[in-house]
Structure formats: C-alpha cells, structure tokens
C-alpha cells in the first residue's frame, strides 16, 4: 500500500493471486450473468421465450453446440480436444454476438460487455491451450455475409434469432464451465 493511506480508505488485505483456472471460471460466470441480463430484456419485450416456433429460425443458424466427439462430457472426456472445441466454439459465437449489438435498447452497454468479455475469455483460454494450431478461426467474409443475412430478416425472425443466440450461448458456456472444472 502506498504511503499516505488514510484510515477510512484502507486497501483490501493481500490474498492469494488468482490462478488461471479460477480466473477463467469467474470470467465465464461474468458472461453468464450478462446473458441473464440480456435475456430478461428479450423475454420482457416479446413472447419469444415461450414460443414453440423456434425450429423456423433455427434453420438459419449454425450455432456451436457441444457433441460427444468434442470430449467435453464426462464420458469420453479429453482435455485437449475439449479445450480446442471451447475456443473454436467461442470464436464461432463472435459473429452472433456482433449481431446482438444493435438488438437491445435499454441493455446496449450490457450487450457490449458480453461481447468484450467473450473476447477476453478467448484470450485467457488461448494462453491455456497447448495445441493452438488445431483451432480454426472463422472466415471473415463468411461471417460478414452471415451478419448481413441475419440483419435482413423480418422483425419476428430477428427477435427469435436474438432469443436463440442467447439461449445457445448460455448452454455452450455452461457446458464449457463444467468441462473446464475437470481440467
């Protein structure tokens, strides 16, 4: 603590520095809290959260999902394969998070925070990964045309797309969190 500390403004006591695993865990929970805040606005604004017509919109989307072969589930768990899947999936979600940026009126700042904190999470995970060569980065041209296509949808489909992105991202992060806690 620097000199000149006054008694009413005492710094927190020293604690053990955060480990990589702890910090990644906290970062995922940070993003999940952000998703909850965004979902609250989405569900209040429209009835998408109760809709049964999700399949109609889902056809337009290719949202990352965890599968058995990814090595992230308890059966057939493979640390390296799973970490590659988590990073690749997050990179694939980035275009969808970009789409979300203009979809919120009262939660504009939260949408930006979710996008930026995901970029930070990717950085943290890339430091942890040994096999960075196995991580495929999405093609920027493909992403740009996907973004244009999503933004050209009618209002109902855009609302549904927003809801599906948030739901899928939440599920992906929850699976990632469980898997990372085993590493």
């Amino acid at each position: 603590v620097p000199p000149g500390e006054d008694s009413k403004d005492v710094a927190a006591p020293h604690r053990q520095p955060l480990t990589s695993s702890e910090r990644i865990d906290k970062q995922i929970r940070y993003i999940l809290d952000g998703i909850s805040a965004l979902r609250k606005e989405t569900c209040n604004k429209s009835n998408m959260c109760e809709s049964s017509k999700e399949a109609l919109a889902e056809n337009n989307l290719n949202l990352p999902k965890m599968a058995e072969k990814d090595g992230c589930f308890q059966s057939g768990f493979n640390e390296e394969t799973c970490l590659v899947k988590i990073i690749t999936g997050l990179l694939e979600f980035e275009v969808y998070l970009e789409y979300l940026q203009n979809r919120f009126e009262s939660s504009e700042e939260q949408a930006r925070a979710v996008q930026m904190s995901t970029k930070v999470l990717i950085q943290f995970l890339q430091k942890k990964a040994k096999n960075l060569d196995a991580i495929t980065t999405p093609d920027p041209t493909t992403n740009a045309s996907l973004l244009t296509k999503l933004q050209a949808q009618n209002q109902w489909l855009q609302d549904m797309t927003t809801h599906l992105i948030l739901r899928s991202f939440k599920e992906f992060l929850q699976s990632s969190l469980r898997a990372l806690r085993q590493m």
Epitope: L18, R23, Q110
Partner: nanobody, 131 residues
C-alpha cells in the same frame, strides 16, 4: 514474490506527454482490474483512471478526462497510462494497483477509483510537470 512495478515517470514541460507502464511479477496482471492513482505532496491520494479485466471498459476521473488514456495489453501482461496535455497540477507520484472490483457483471465502474477495491500496489513513479 508478488509485486507491481510502475515505470515511465519523469520531468516534462506543461502541455507535454508521458507514458506510464505497469507490469507485475508473481501474478498475472491480465486477471485483475487495474487502477492508476496519484498522490501530490500534502494531498490525499486520488484515483485517475481504471480498466476492467472482464470487459476492458474504462473509467476516468473528471480531472483527466480527454487527456489521459488507460489501456492494457494482455499478451504483454502490461497496463499503460498515456498522459497528454500535462499541467503542473498533474505533478504527483503515480501508483498502479490491481484488484477484483470488476468480476461481478453490472459492477459500478466509478467504484474502481476507491483504493479499498485493490489488493496489490506498486511503489510509484514520480511525474513532475514544470510550472
């Protein structure tokens, strides 16, 4: 040993610029919210700028807004404070500090200039703007 080290201080003419750096040893700086504080002789320490580790958002005290820029490079594990249009009243010892004030979504950004939010402190670097 866990420590923060500031560098880049010095003597400068009014209107000049200086760039401060903050690096860590013994822990990963990228995992923490970082604040820059300053203390002039006979004055209370004040928070001038901070940057989140969670979403990279920034906050500035009114006294430095538009003149100072805080940034971080997670690959280099370093945080910077670029100070432009310096005034004699910017003369002080500048400290960087690391804390976990930014780990809860919806944290109040302005809280980051409160010293009790920080766990680790550097020894400081002197910045003198000639009057």
């Amino acid at each position: 040993q866990v420590q923060l080290v500031e560098s880049g201080g010095g003597l400068v003419q009014p209107g000049g610029s200086l760039g401060l750096s903050c690096a860590a040893s013994g822990f990963t700086l990228a995992y923490y919210g970082i604040g820059w504080f300053r203390q002039a002789p006979g004055k209370e320490r004040e928070g001038v700028a901070c940057i989140s580790s969670s979403d990279l958002s920034t906050y500035y005290a009114d006294s430095v807004k538009g003149r100072f820029t805080i940034s971080r490079d997670n690959a280099k594990d370093t945080v910077y404070l670029q100070m432009n249009s310096l005034k004699p009243e910017d003369t002080a010892v500048y400290y960087c500090a690391a804390g976990t004030w930014d780990l809860k979504f919806g944290y109040s950004r302005s809280n980051c200039v409160r010293s009790y939010e920080y766990d680790y402190w550097g020894q400081g670097t002197q910045v003198t703007v000639l009057s």
